[in-house]
């Protein structure tokens, strides 16, 4: 466990021409606040998860009134850090979104109004416990300067906050096999000992003495497979003897969603579906009108002229939620072919193709006949998503590169003997048979079923198959 900390240093006009108009005026004084959203991973998949590492809102900054005629300066900022606690290991790579919001404090009916001024995003590598990292990001004509770090909460230490430390029992050194806990040299690394008997295959622990079960296993030592057939409770019923899940506390217990929001569990945490007029991680932001721009991702806001009348966001294709903040799961239609992995990036669908396949939907089989040569005069034959080479006589193998033994298939009938020949094979027929493969019997009266043998070739002579 630990905390991601964000310190905003300045928010103001960026360098270069086209300085932005001040967001505040004498008629409409305002103040700023910030929102940070963190997602695990550097990769494109990070776009799929909604603030899976956590999110935080800053306090409101000092009230600012623009001086007439003066250029927009750096705007006064809220005090303090934005802190995003994380319960599990720090992932080391993460994506962030930092939003700058304006709160207008004019005499409008119904209290303050909010609007989004700027949004910046990026992907970074960061080890927990390291120094502050400085960054500058630009959004349009605005520039945001900030620092960030991740730090572990005791007793966790390490670059991922997964090692545990405890005070030394002896002043001089740590116990056998245990290292000092840098940078806390007066402490020792604590061995992570799970509860005695905890199944090594189906259980794990994040704190000493506990035994947490992997999905599909239950019981105090995670040794009982879950069977849902006799289970009645919503999250699975109750006893270790029946092998049913005990409904322990879940992330939605006590409903963390405010203002009538409904909670649904996600693999990492929970997600709130907010009623109209509210949004935020826990539906805590309220009093919003269309003037505040509450519809994300290009949604069109309708109605909501004042805070008492609800607005409606008409979402663009691919987005949903009362504020168009959620992405439709297009991957559920499995558009990627040939076992490709689907990634919904919002602006586009991407397919990660398995080896041997390519194309935007993994539709091209790289092993097909296109651009493929069969050696030694063989011809390529496609079929069933694969290909094969039909080889010329005397050659075999996947690409017709191997010299084939023409006699391997025993081509000479009726006991004829096969001889390999540079141009193919020769059959020496047993008495009473003739033909290239000894397939024709010689009639008892000396005539064959074929026209008379060519001059100089008696029945029984070897026949060469060209």
């Amino acid at each position: 466990a630990g905390v991601f900390e964000l310190q905003i240093h300045s928010f103001g006009p960026g360098p270069g021409p086209g300085a932005p108009r001040s967001p505040c005026s004498a008629r409409l004084p305002c103040r700023l606040f910030f929102r940070v959203c963190l997602k695990p991973g550097l990769s494109e998949e990070a776009a799929e998860s909604p603030c899976a590492l956590g999110a935080a809102l800053s306090a409101r900054g000092p009230v600012y009134t623009e001086q007439p005629g003066a250029p927009a300066p750096d705007l006064p900022l809220p005090d303090g850090l934005l802190q995003v606690p994380f319960r599990d290991a720090w992932p080391g790579t993460f994506s962030f979104i930092i939003e700058t919001w304006r709160e207008e404090l004019g005499d409008q009916i119904g209290g303050p109004a909010w609007s989004l001024l700027a949004r910046v995003a990026g992907r970074r590598r960061l080890a927990a416990g390291g120094p502050w990292a400085r960054d500058i990001q630009r959004a349009g004509a605005w520039e945001l300067r900030f620092s960030y770090r991740a730090r572990c909460e005791p007793p966790a230490v390490g670059t991922a906050c997964t090692r545990l430390c405890r005070p030394r029992s002896a002043p001089s050194r740590c116990g056998p096999g245990l290292r000092p806990c840098a940078p806390l040299e007066d402490e020792c690394e604590a061995p992570l000992v799970c509860r005695a008997g905890c199944s090594p295959e189906h259980g794990f622990c994040e704190q000493p003495g506990e035994c947490r079960c992997l999905e599909g296993w239950t019981g105090p030592l995670c040794t009982v497979p879950v069977s849902t057939s006799s289970c009645l409770s919503p999250r699975g019923p109750s006893s270790a003897t029946t092998g049913c899940l005990v409904p322990g506390p879940g992330p939605c217990d006590g409903n963390p969603c405010a203002n009538g929001g409904s909670c649904s569990e996600t693999p990492r945490s929970f997600e709130c579906t907010c009623p109209r007029g509210f949004y935020g991680l826990r539906c805590e932001v309220s009093g919003v009108t269309c003037a505040d721009g509450p519809c994300f991702n290009g949604g069109l806001c309708v109605g909501g002229a004042d805070p008492d009348s609800a607005y409606i966001c008409h979402c663009p294709p691919g987005f949903q939620g009362s504020n168009c903040e959620k992405r439709v799961d297009r991957c559920s239609l499995q558009p990627c072919r040939n076992g490709g992995l689907c990634l919904d990036l919002g602006h586009a669908l991407r397919c990660r193709c398995r080896a041997g396949f390519a194309g935007p939907r993994c539709e091209h089989d790289l092993d097909d006949c296109a651009g493929r040569a069969c050696a030694n005069g063989g011809t390529c034959v496609e079929g069933g998503g694969a290909h094969r080479c039909s080889c010329a006589l005397g050659f075999g193998g996947r690409d017709c590169r191997e010299r084939a033994d023409p006699c391997a298939a025993r081509p000479c009938a009726h006991g004829g003997r096969c001889y390999a020949h540079f141009s193919g094979l020769v059959c020496a027929c047993a008495p009473g048979y003739m033909g290239a493969r000894c397939e024709f019997p010689v009639h008892p009266d000396g005539a064959s079923a074929l026209p008379a043998a060519p001059p100089g070739l008696r029945p029984g002579d070897p026949q060469r198959y060209l």
Epitope: P317, G318, R330, L333, Q334, P335, C336, R337, N338, G340, L349, G359, P360, R361, C362, E363
Partner: nanobody, 120 residues
């Protein structure tokens, strides 16, 4: 540009039936995947049924045995035959298609949606 036009929505009593149609038109090189999603008030949009990139037909668990998905390749049209309808099937039903506009370019398209209401 590709257009998806849905039809067949309406109001029906529980246990009743409806048949939705969705026709794709425009610059279509080939259709990679196509199907039906639905969105009930206050809920997430979810897949109902469709054919996948590999040509398999896929159904949501909640509609298996009640809804039948079919397609007419020659007309670039898909259908959803909905039987034994329940109140919880009430939603806006959207047609979706993953379409190659040429050999190497593919895009996702949504229809405008058609409302299905199931009430006594």
């Amino acid at each position: 540009e590709v257009q998806l036009v849905e039809s067949g929505g309406g109001e029906v009593q529980p246990g009743g039936s409806l048949r939705l149609s969705c026709a794709a038109s425009g610059s279509i090189f080939s259709i990679n995947a196509m199907g039906w999603y639905r969105q009930a008030p206050g809920k997430q949009r979810e897949l109902v049924a469709g054919f996948t990139g590999d040509g398999m037909t896929k159904y949501a668990e909640s509609v298996k045995g009640r809804f039948t998905f079919s397609r007419d390749n020659a007309k670039n049209t898909v259908y959803l035959q909905m039987s034994s309808l329940r109140a919880e099937d009430t939603a806006v039903y959207y047609c979706a298609a993953d379409v190659f506009t040429d050999r190497d370019h593919v895009d996702w398209y949504w229809g405008q949606g058609t409302l299905v209401t199931v009430k006594p």
